[in-house]
């Protein structure tokens, strides 16, 4: 285990927390419960108690946010960074923030609470078996009333437990119609609508009339969201799967991986994919809010990342249903706060919120159906998480940013550095690297930890290159360079030792330029570098666009691969080939799809 510098900790044992806002991915009661259970893990092994309060005077403020959310450490969209937390202290210190661009679940797919049926409000179980078929979303199969339902256990055929999924045919929210269900079709501004609509609103909320004529009655409600069938990616992000849909002449009542080589589940967002070509990916397993929160609260209590892979405080997301705390976590937290006074409590139990009473007219009986085909099984989990580096330390304390789930190089948006070493391409990101060898069907191998192979290096690298003759590896990060020859390292040395002035903040890339010579890049400038002397020729300074016309001026990485130069900006590269002393851009592409041959979404 590791603690923050100075063993930062709370100096009182009755810790308070405030849930400042919520994610729409989970019912509020489930979020409340996940956080309470996560705190209970730590109170079970220490003298700490955790009390929920309703003001920002709390020790730990919990917030869901996206991108720049007011603390100077922006989130990065889906996947990547999942959450971050600050070590104990006043104000923002101790607070835990969760990236709301993630799909938050309990680690096993979207959480869809049910109503009525016979399962007492239990959540859907995805995937579930019904009449021998596997379903990864709510379905209307077996019903003539169009109400979506799901099984609340893995197998409806054997267990017979079911409930109804959120549906505008069951109820609406807010509005002015007391939660009555939608009336389809309904008239709005003289037009007939047979589904929820966003027409007439600028905020994107779906609504419907609860009588046949909105223009006359002005009664409406908002349509419940259907987390189980709201698609991501594809060309219809945010829209709902339409079941059944037709694909290649065949009808599908659930998400399918047909037509894809990568096994990912998808659905059409109209009833006919063949004619409309509208589709998106079905929700994945999501990230367990309970497990991520337990990790974050560890930081908020004073624990930094652990180097023990099985520990909760290890900086990688890994879904587990076993007890999350490892001995290392317990040792760490007890180092700060001591053990819990005897007796040890029983592990916390979870409660499922009770469903509200059914309306007077409620949907009838369980479904009966005779399906004609069996789709593929439910979705598999996302790639497990890889570590991300901490942001630079603040004036008084360091903060930690844990848990990024990009173990698959194909999920990395932007690599820190790329280099050809030996005859393989090495891709570096946040303390990890992957190796890639070109070839039909080959995939990047990894991730491997940089610290295991090159222990002297920082987690964040700006550029890397190998000098072929001496086999020396140059690693640049900020104003420093490390030179590895085999396992021995020279450095870190400051860039000015290479003859680069104080105005050069980083080296963003390198290309070979004749025997024992390289070109070093920094932003818009480049220099000729003598590898043996380990010095740049200051007179060789030049502008990148003079030597390489057509490449972007704000590249973050330049590397050589298969004798061609690659200039990276964002997720893209500009490839330059040299013919008779002329440098010409001959290709622009995606690093992941076009170099690493990743499957396209």
């Amino acid at each position: 285990f590791q603690t923050f510098e100075g063993d930062l900790k709370w100096h009182h044992h009755n810790i308070t927390y405030w849930i400042q806002n919520y994610s729409e991915d989970l019912p509020r009661a489930v979020i409340d419960d996940a956080f309470a259970r996560a705190f209970a893990l730590w109170s079970a092994v220490t003298p700490l108690t955790f009390t929920r309060v309703y003001s920002r005077d709390a020790d730990i403020v919990i917030q869901f946010g996206v991108a720049e959310h007011g603390d100077g450490y922006p989130f990065d969209g889906k996947d990547g960074l999942l959450a971050h937390a600050f070590p104990p202290g006043p104000g923002i210190q101790g607070d835990a923030h969760f990236d709301d661009d993630e799909l938050w679940s309990l680690g096993k797919g979207v959480v869809v609470p049910t109503r009525f049926g016979n399962a007492d409000g239990a959540a859907c179980h995805f995937p579930f078996i019904f009449e021998g078929r596997s379903y990864s979303a709510c379905t209307t199969d077996g019903r003539s009333d169009g109400l979506p339902w799901c099984s609340t256990t893995a197998n409806y055929d054997t267990d017979d437990r079911f409930g109804f999924c959120p549906s505008e045919r069951l109820y609406t929210q807010d509005g002015n119609a007391d939660g009555k269900p939608c009336q389809f079709p309904f008239i709005f501004q003289g037009q007939s609508y047979s589904a929820c609509t966003t027409d007439g609103r600028s905020d994107g909320y779906r609504w419907c009339a609860t009588t046949a004529n909105y223009d006359r009655d002005k009664l409406f409600g908002f349509c419940p969201t259907r987390a189980d069938s709201t698609v991501m990616g594809g060309n219809s992000a945010g829209e709902l799967c339409v079941f059944p849909f037709t694909f290649l002449g065949k009808e599908y009542s659930t998400c399918t991986s047909e037509g894809r080589g990568d096994g990912r589940l998808w659905c059409a967002t109209t009833s006919n994919f063949d004619s409309d070509k509208k589709w998106g990916f079905c929700p994945d397993q999501g990230y367990s809010l309970f497990l991520v929160a337990a990790h974050e609260f560890g930081h908020a209590l004073g624990l930094d990342h652990s180097s023990v892979p099985e520990a909760l405080m290890y900086p990688m997301y890994r879904f587990t249903e076993g007890p999350p705390l490892h001995k290392d976590d317990v040792n760490g937290i007890r180092h700060l706060y001591g053990p819990r006074p005897e007796p040890e409590p029983r592990p916390p139990t979870t409660t499922t919120p009770q469903p509200t009473a059914p309306p007077t007219v409620c949907p009838t009986g369980p479904p009966t159906v005779h399906p004609s085909e069996r789709p593929t099984a439910g979705p598999t989990g996302p790639p497990s998480a890889g570590p991300t580096g901490p942001p630079t330390a603040g004036p008084s304390t360091a903060t930690t940013v844990p848990l990024s789930p990009v173990d698959d190089a194909c999920n990395v948006n932007i690599f820190d550095a790329i280099a050809e070493i030996g005859n393989q391409l090495y891709l570096f990101k946040d303390g990890k690297y992957w190796r890639f060898s070109e070839g039909r069907g080959s995939r990047p191998q990894g991730p491997f930890l940089i610290a295991d192979k090159w222990p002297a290096l920082p987690r964040k690298l700006d550029s890397v290159f190998e000098e072929r003759l001496s086999k020396k590896l140059f690693f640049f990060s900020g104003r420093q360079v490390w030179v590895y020859t085999g396992a021995s390292v020279l450095g870190p040395r400051r860039l000015d030792k290479l003859g680069l002035g104080a105005d050069v903040a980083q080296v963003t890339g390198a290309l070979r330029s004749g025997r024992g010579k390289m070109l070093l890049f920094s932003g818009r400038r480049l220099w000729r570098f003598d590898v043996k002397a380990q010095m740049v020729d200051p007179r060789s300074a030049s502008e990148v666009d003079r030597m390489f016309p057509g490449v972007p001026l704000d590249t973050h990485d330049v590397f050589q691969y298969r004798e061609k130069a690659y200039f990276c900006q964002d997720r893209f590269y500009w490839r330059v080939s040299s013919r008779s002393e002329l440098n010409q851009v001959d290709q622009v592409g995606y690093v992941t799809y076009d170099i690493l041959q990743c499957p396209e979404d």
Partner: antibody, heavy 116, light 108 residues
């Protein structure tokens, strides 16, 4: 007592720069952000930007990008806002505010007049 | 840049209830949290409500806030003469802070 005390009024010519200071006391300066908000005469509040005293990261209003710089000096618990290339429509009262789930503590305001 | 829309003015007699609305034009105010500020004439603004409905200590309980779907509201029940002031709503929108145009509350 938690308070923010701002520097005094300034009169500047168009094209000049102004630097307003905001000294914090009564709380741990580095555990909170500071927002800067201005109010032109008879007008509403306009957010200019924000700086984290924890890590010095900044976030500026798009409209002022390139003209405004916010900094902090943690040794004196002071935040600074510099606005360059002043124009007559920059005439306003400039406020600093501690920002933590709402701007809960405000400075008294600094009047900046831009006039030729 | 998103805009938060407030009515320019509202009024009531002492003891009455006054409600000020704040709606988002290009983003869902309902999925953001909203803060409200009171600015008495000639003074700096004061935080009145944070995170939709929470009152900082010292703010009388006649001030209350709510936020659902695309409208946030500030209610003043039992209006008093000292409540005569400008009221501003504020929210975050894609990395920027946005203020409403302000509502002048007059006690008749």
């Amino acid at each position: 007592e938690v308070q923010l005390v701002q520097s005094g009024a300034e009169v500047k010519k168009p094209g000049a720069s102004v630097k307003v200071s905001c000294k914090a006391s009564g709380y741990t300066f580095t555990s909170y952000g500071i927002s800067w908000v201005r109010q032109a005469p008879g007008q509403g509040l306009e957010w200019m930007g924000w700086i984290s005293a924890y890590n010095a990261n900044t976030n500026y209003a798009q409209k002022l990008q390139g003209r405004v710089t916010m900094t902090t000096d943690t040794s004196t618990s002071t935040a600074y806002m510099e606005l360059r290339s002043l124009r007559s429509d920059d005439t306003a009262v400039y406020y600093c505010a501690r920002d933590y789930y709402g701007m809960d503590v405000w400075g008294q305001g600094t009047t900046v007049t831009v006039s030729s | 840049q998103a805009v938060l829309t407030q009515p320019p003015s509202a009024s009531g007699t002492p003891g009455q209830r006054v409600t000020i609305s704040c709606s988002g034009s290009t983003f869902n105010i309902g999925s953001n949290t909203v803060n409200w500020y009171q600015q008495l004439p000639g003074t700096a603004p004061k935080l009145l409500i944070y995170s939709d409905s929470h009152r900082p200590s010292g703010v009388p309980d006649r001030f209350s806030g709510s936020n659902s779907w695309n409208t946030a509201s500030l209610a003043i029940s039992g209006l008093q003469s000292e409540d005569e002031a400008d009221y501003y709503c504020q929210a975050w929108d894609s990395s920027a802070v946005v203020f409403g145009g302000g509502t002048k509350v007059t006690v008749l």
